[in-house]
Structures are given as C-alpha cells and as structure tokens.
C-alpha cells in the first residue's frame, strides 16, 4: 500500500513540526493504525502510534509528543517538543487493521529539521 | 571544473549559515572569483561575490551579507541576516581568473533552511 509524505519539513522555532501522511487505501478500512518512526544514524525508534476509527479523532497516549487529525485517507500529524538533536527522518507507517484484509504501507520519510532557539536575554 | 558544496545547511536561529565551497583546480590559479547565487522559484539572484588572491583574505563589499575565508582550494562562506523568506538553494560559482586559461565551475547548490525565531517576551 502506497504511503505519501513530504520530503522535508522545518520545525517551528517552538519545536513543532506538522506534516500530512496520505495513504492509497485499497479497501474500505474502518480501523486504521498510524505509527511514526524516527530513523537517524541507522537507528529506528518509535515516536508515537495511534489507532483510530475512520471519521473519528486520532487518540495518542496522554504523554505522547504527537497529536493528529484524520480526513479520509489523510492523517495530519503534529510532533511537539522537538529539539535540534531530534532532527532526523520521520517515517509514517499506516496499517489498515479492520475489516480484513490487513494492509501495511510505509512512507519514504519526512526529514524534519529542528533548530534550537537562542535563549532570550534575562529581563532584569 | 568541479565544485563541491554541502546539500543542506540549517541557518542558526540568529540567521547565520556557513558552508564550504571546494573546487578541483586544474591549474595553479593566483586570482579566484567566488560568487554565491540564490535559486528560488526558478529565479536566480546574485547574493554576493568576491575576488581574492590565493593565500589572501576574501573581501566582499562592505554592505555584503557574506563573509569568507580561503584555504587552498576551499572557500568557507558565511551568509548573515537570513530570514525564513530567504530559504532557498544557494549556488557556489567559482572562476579561476588568472593566469590563463580561465576556468568556470558551478556547484549543485546548498539548500539553506531558515526559521524565523519567536520574539522574546517584552521585559516590563
């Protein structure tokens, strides 16, 4: 299953990056799982994951750095609290869980660049 | 003549970006001209240019946003005062001016990403 995502995204100076993950659904899925994985220096780590029912809100864990909304075959993902050291390739993985058949799609990744802001001068 | 430069550079939160432009000199040039061009939306504009004698300092115009140093066939370029709207592909053009023969080399460009910082809160 094909998954499309932008090649490059810049995090804002507040450390927030948003991108769209779009999948070409071969069937009429009602339950979808979206996972964001970060690849840097050939290491892959799971950033966040959410399962949602089509037409409903994505619900990530309470302590997750991700939030998102869905619209048809598009998922709008936002990752917060990013620092320069979090710069890397963020890969969108989509699984059509239900009803069968199961489909898996993995995007080529979005390179997120993060620049740490200069500290503001002390206000004396 | 081959010119090498990095594919991507992030400007600092102060709007400063530095990169190295390296050329494979076919001869023993004594006078070299370096030009930085910016390509965005298929428009190419000249950012800055400097001519230098090998072993000497690069001297850009006083009001130039560029500064630089040279070391052998490497030129270390720094561009200052960058804003988010200045994000684009910065191409390094190197000309071996003297002695003849004249050589021209153009790099593939360095994509410079610039993020505007959040304003600091007013200190009341």
């Amino acid at each position: 299953m094909h998954v499309a995502q932008p090649a490059v995204v810049l995090a804002s100076s507040r450390g927030i990056a948003s991108f769209v993950c779009e999948y070409a659904s071969p069937g009429k899925a009602t339950e979808v799982r979206v996972t964001v994985l970060r690849q840097a220096d050939s290491q892959v780590t799971e950033v966040c994951a959410a399962t949602y029912m089509m037409g409903n809100e994505l619900t990530f864990l309470d302590d997750s750095i991700c939030t998102g909304t869905s619209s048809g075959n598009q998922v709008n993902l936002t990752i917060q609290g990013l620092r320069a050291m979090d710069t890397g390739l963020y890969i969108c993985k989509v699984e059509l869980m239900y009803p069968p058949p199961y489909y898996l799609g993995i995007g080529n990744g979005t390179q997120i660049y993060v620049i740490d802001p200069e500290p503001c001068p002390d206000s004396d | 003549m081959h010119v090498a430069q990095p594919a991507v550079v992030l400007a600092s939160s102060r709007g400063i970006a530095s990169f190295v432009c390296e050329y494979a000199s076919p001869g023993k040039a004594t006078e070299v001209r370096v030009t930085v061009l910016r390509q965005a939306d298929s428009q190419v504009t000249e950012v800055c240019a400097a001519t230098y004698m090998m072993g000497n300092e690069l001297t850009f115009l006083d009001d130039s946003i560029c500064t630089g140093t040279s070391s052998g066939n490497q030129v270390n370029l720094t561009i200052q005062g960058l804003r988010a709207m200045d994000t684009g592909l910065y191409i390094c053009k190197v000309e071996l001016m003297y002695p003849p023969p004249y050589y021209l080399g153009i790099g593939n460009g360095t994509q410079i990403y610039v993020i505007d910082p959040e304003p600091c809160p007013d200190s009341d």
């Epitope: 799982r33 996972t35 994985l37 690849q39 892959v44 780590t45 799971e46 994951a49 864990l61 890969i91 993985k93 898996l104 993995i106 | -």
Partner: nanobody
Framework: QVQLQESGGGSVQAGGSLRLSCAAS????????MTWLRQAPGKGLEWVST???????SYADSVKGRFAISRDNAKNILYLQLNSLEIEDTGMYYC??????RGQGTQVTVSS
C-alpha cells in the same frame, strides 16, 4: 540485520492450544508496537493482535478472549498464546513491527 523469526506452529485438534513465538534480532521488541497477523488459505492477511511499547494490547473480535499477546523483554521474544482453537484459525501466522516486513511465518492447522 533486523529480522523476525516466527515459530511454535503445528497441527492441533479444535479446542486445543498452541503458543507462537516471534524472535527478534537487530532491534529491541519492547521499544516498538508489535503485531500478529494471519493468512488463511486463499485469503488476504488479517490483523490478529497488537501490543504497544507501553504494554497495551488489542485484539480482533474473532480472537478476543481466546488469544493472548505478550512479550519477554529479556529474551526479546513476542508471544501469541492460542487457546480454544477453531477450524477458522487455520493459517500462516506472522509477526510484524517497526519498519520490518513480516517474518517467514509459522503454520497453524486446526482440524476437527
């Protein structure tokens, strides 16, 4: 190299039990959401169960109350306990996680 290897399948009578294992090499299972899938003869893949990095589990309605997903973090192995097996549970079972494609699978055959 990142690899997943399933084992533990076999032939069993309806109502019987099996425990499937998925051994991971090249990555730490507990850091990822891991999924069990199955494919019945002549059919497409079907999602069976998932365990996330925090340990939360979910199951397809068809196996709820009969199957249990778990993992051994020390051994880096994912398990699927299959109880009260039914003929419809026959198929090839696969594990999947992270960016890995699924393993080779292990065959489960349930007969009457």
């Amino acid at each position: 190299q990142v690899q997943l290897q399933e084992s533990g399948g076999g032939s069993v009578q309806a109502g019987g039990s099996l425990r499937l294992s998925c051994a991971a090499s090249g990555f730490t299972l507990s850091s990822y959401t891991m999924t069990w899938l199955r494919q019945a003869p002549g059919k497409g893949l079907e999602w069976v169960s998932t365990i996330n990095s925090g340990g939360s589990t979910s199951y397809a309605d068809s196996v709820k109350g009969r199957f249990a997903i778990s993992r051994d973090n020390a051994k880096n192995i994912l398990y699927l306990q299959l109880n009260s097996l039914e003929i419809e549970d026959t198929g090839m079972y696969y594990c999947q996680g992270g960016l890995t494609q699924r393993g080779q699978g292990t065959q489960v055959t349930v007969s009457s």
